[in-house]
């Protein structure tokens, strides 16, 4: 799996999970989240050569097409596969609210 | 929806469905498929600016991050959303076989 256990160790040029810490205030301009101040969002990036973690038959076809027609810009892309939620604390007036934001943390990647 | 009805009419710079005809023999080196000789595979391509057909909360966060930090290359990517199968005819010896290859045709796209 193209997850932290593999990708953070191997720093692949191909599609892999990349660490990314996001500071809510500095990086997103969000002042409404009280805790946490930021989180390890991670993201997916890297090349998608033929058969590198292809998600579908179409992405396999596309990467093979791209191998044979390298001048074409039709190639698969490295995107998130498994995502996890993030629990946040914010306030409405003086009332604290705890909420789980779904699909905030990328855990693994794929070529799609 | 970022499908043919919208994308083929509007020729968007942003993430959209793009037409792509694939000739099995010429483009993939596949000689085993007897019919069809090729098919409209299509593919997804284009920019993923903030809120342009974002797939998940993470892709929305990432596109906002990329807006505020444009020098970073951590941005969502335009990939297939809905896919359809393709029915093919091939031969094993002299015996014709009809098979449905799943996820061969892209019908719509998303930023993920």
């Amino acid at each position: 799996a193209l997850d932290a256990a593999y990708c953070f160790r191997n720093v692949q040029d191909n599609c892999c999970l990349r660490p990314l810490y996001i500071d809510f205030k500095r990086d997103l301009g969000w002042k409404w989240i009280h805790e946490p101040k930021g989180y390890n969002a991670n993201f997916c990036a890297g090349a998608c050569p033929y058969l590198w973690s292809s998600d579908t038959q179409h992405s396999r076809v596309l990467s093979l097409y791209n191998t044979i027609n390298p001048e074409a810009s039709a190639s698969p892309c490295c995107v998130s596969q498994d995502l996890e939620p993030l629990t946040i604390l914010y306030y409405i007036g003086k009332t604290p609210k705890i909420e789980q934001l779904s699909n905030m943390i990328v855990k693994s990647c794929k070529c799609s | 929806a970022l499908d043919a009805a919208y994308c083929f009419r509007n020729v968007q710079d942003n993430c959209c469905l793009r037409p792509l005809y694939i000739d099995f023999k010429r483009d993939l080196g596949w000689k085993w498929i007897h019919e069809p000789k090729g098919y409209n595979a299509n593919f997804c391509a284009g920019a993923c600016p903030y809120l342009w057909s974002s797939d998940t909360q993470h892709s929305r966060v990432l596109s906002l991050y990329n807006t505020i930090n444009p020098e970073a290359s951590a941005s969502p990517c335009c990939v297939s959303q809905d896919l359809e199968p393709l029915t093919i005819l091939y031969y094993i010896g002299k015996t014709p076989k009809i098979e449905q290859l799943s996820n061969m045709i892209v019908k719509s796209c998303k930023c993920s």
Epitope: R18, P19, G46 | A72, S73
Partner: nanobody, 119 residues
């Protein structure tokens, strides 16, 4: 709070050597790849090197390949950059960064350490 403190810079003659260090705190250092980036006077940030979390995989920019060596000591939460055969064009402020700076550019946390190569 994630903190990175670079040290080891200085003035060195062309052909000389230096070893930069980066002390990391506030996160689980051993789980993350780490990078070195640099900023020459009047220029943007340039990626120099990246090392995998266990130190096994290393990549270098073409401009430093064969001259610089990245390493890490996970027990000490420290990243290193051994710089040999230094050239005047290596003059820059050097920063360490968490993650793979080939993909997330323009982000530095520490104050950096100045390296000047001049005769």
């Amino acid at each position: 709070q994630l903190q990175l403190v670079e040290s080891g810079g200085g003035l060195v003659q062309p052909g000389g050597s230096l070893t930069l260090s980066c002390a990391a705190s506030g996160f689980t250092f051993s789980l993350y790849p780490m990078s070195w980036v640099r900023q020459a006077p009047g220029k943007g940030l340039e990626w120099v090197s990246v090392i995998g979390s266990d130190g096994g995989t290393k990549h270098y920019s073409d401009s430093v390949k064969g001259r610089f060596a990245i390493s890490r000591d996970n027990a000490k939460n420290t990243l290193y950059l051994q710089m040999n055969s230094l050239k005047p064009e290596d003059t820059a402020v050097y920063y360490c960064a968490e993650g793979d700076s080939r993909y997330v550019r323009g982000r530095t946390r520490g104050q950096g350490t100045q390296v000047t190569v001049s005769s």
